[in-house]
């Protein structure tokens, strides 16, 4: 009764330092209350990057200084994150809980690796 | 005698479109005289992008209008592609042919997956 | 606060049968999957078998299949373990413990203080 | 089945220092399918991480797990002498749900 989580392998963030994905997940059951959680790891560490629970059918809410956003729709989570820098390229993982109704499941994907290129700075205006 | 040819898997362009690897190939023979082929790979074409015959020892050249400019160190050749844009996003592959003396060897790398974000335009400085 | 409290352990002589019981409480018992650990003395964990939320699934180590059956009562909050043609290698302490999931595993977050069982003739 | 192979066997350190244990699987584990616990001599073991790098409740965040495959890893930040104990790496990803042999982190 495993929960596959599917996530893209390579996103580029843009020029602005926003990178987006979806995460997919094969749900098991019927669930109402799902939680999203997206982990950074590089260098062997892993890191919580944010989080947020949601009811199906729902408004994805990460908290005020997140700086992730979201949508849902179905099975799917449509995940941007921003403000990001070059020394944030590294591996987002995915994590995906069905809190309620019991019993619990959880699902982790393989990662996105989301390369980031600080832009040249803008040559200043006389 | 097959002659293994090594190239890291991805790069990324700086924000001014320019994209370093090195290509480095184990010589089965004593060559005098190689070639270096840089090839891309997307959607199953692959075109060359640029190509350089060089003396052992000697400086890399390619032609006055190559995207693509060089040097050698031993068995290593240390490419740079300018001028690219996000389409030409894509897997090049780094091809190596000892031309001389003979016998003839010829290897090719895995490819390098470079990746190009095109940069934001900068203000109109008024 | 959620306990587990196993019992039944003992002393038994080999080829013999014994049950193992553990109540549990502070929980919504028929929500999680329930594993049975072992621990002979002075030696590492052993997982034993486990039981899905609603018993319709049920797995064993290759060590004990075909001898030991898990089985749960969710009305009685109890979890079991019948322990049929009992091997000296069988000795050990017995501990219950409560799983995250349901009927997929991924953790084992609540442990009782074990039971042990002794196979001597 | 599933073999998982902890390393070193024996840890010495000192309370402040950083812990690196490892665990090897004989094939590739779901990340989401590995579990590390703590044991204490005459004491139930305590669950720390599960899906390789989630902590469990009460977990202190000294404590953290990373790796993929079959290679899998837990640290302990700065070692507090609480610390001091056998850890066990677990699969879920197949059964039987084998544990490893364990690592004893002692006292320097």
């Known amino acids: 009764k495993a929960m596959h989580v599917a996530q893209p392998a390579v996103v580029l963030a843009n020029s602005r330092g926003i990178a987006s994905f979806v995460c997919e997940y094969a749900s098991p059951g019927k669930a109402t209350e799902v939680r999203v959680t997206v982990l950074r790891q590089a260098d062997s560490q892993v890191t919580e990057v944010c989080a947020a629970t949601y009811m199906m059918g729902n408004e994805l809410t990460f908290l005020d200084d997140s700086i992730c956003t979201g949508t849902s729709s179905g099975n799917q989570v449509n995940l941007t994150i921003q403000g990001l820098r070059a020394m944030d390229t590294g591996l987002y993982i995915c994590k995906v809980e069905l809190m309620y109704p019991p019993p619990y499941y959880m699902g982790i994907g393989n990662g996105t690796q989301i390369y980031v290129i600080d832009p040249e700075p803008c040559p200043d205006s006389d | 005698k097959a002659m293994h040819v090594a190239q890291p898997a991805v790069v990324l362009a700086n924000s001014r479109g320019i994209a370093s690897f090195v290509c480095e190939y184990a010589s089965p023979g004593k060559a005098t005289e190689v070639r270096v082929t840089v090839l891309r790979q997307a959607d199953s074409q692959v075109t060359e992008v640029c190509a350089a015959t060089y003396m052992m020892g000697n400086e890399l050249t390619f032609l006055d209008d190559s995207i693509c400019t060089g040097t050698s160190s031993g068995n290593q050749v240390n490419l740079t592609i300018q001028g690219l844009r996000a389409m030409d996003t894509g897997l090049y592959i780094c091809k190596v042919e000892l031309m001389y003396p003979p016998p003839y060897y010829m290897g090719i790398g895995n490819g390098t997956q470079i990746y190009v974000i095109d940069p934001e335009p900068c203000p109109d400085s008024d | 606060q959620v306990q587990l409290v196993e019992s039944g352990g003992g002393v038994v002589q080999p080829g013999r049968s014994l049950r193992l019981s553990c109540a549990a409480s502070?929980?919504?018992?028929?929500?999680?999957?329930m594993h049975w650990v072992r621990q002979a003395p002075g030696k590492g964990l052993e997982w034993v078998a486990v039981?899905?939320?609603?018993?319709?699934?049920?797995y064993y180590a290759d060590s004990v299949k075909g001898r030991f059956t898990i089985s749960r009562d969710n009305s009685k909050n109890t979890l079991y373990l019948q322990m049929n043609s009992l091997r000296a290698e069988d000795a050990a302490v017995y501990y219950c413990a409560k799983d995250l999931g349901g009927d997929d595993y991924y953790g084992m977050d609540v442990w009782g203080q074990g039971t042990t069982v002794t196979v001597s003739s | 089945e599933i073999v998982l192979t902890q390393s070193p066997g024996t840890l010495s350190l000192s309370p402040g220092e950083r812990a690196t244990l490892s665990c090897r699987a004989s094939q590739s584990v779901s990340r989401t399918y590995l579990a590390w616990y703590q044991q204490k001599p005459g004491q139930a073991p305590r669950l720390l991480i599960y899906?390789?790098?989630s902590r469990a409740t009460g977990i202190p965040d000294r404590f953290s797990g990373s790796g993929s495959g079959t290679d899998f890893t837990l640290t302990i930040s700065r070692l507090e002498p609480e610390d001091f104990a056998v850890y066990y790496c677990?699969?879920?990803?197949?059964?039987?749900?084998?544990f490893g042999q364990g690592t004893k982190l002692e006292i320097k």
């Open positions: 502070g929980l919504t018992f028929s929500y999680y999957g």
């Open positions: 899906g390789a790098f």
């Open positions: 677990q699969q879920y990803g197949s059964s039987p749900y084998t």
């Open positions: 039981i899905s939320y609603d018993g319709s699934n049920k």
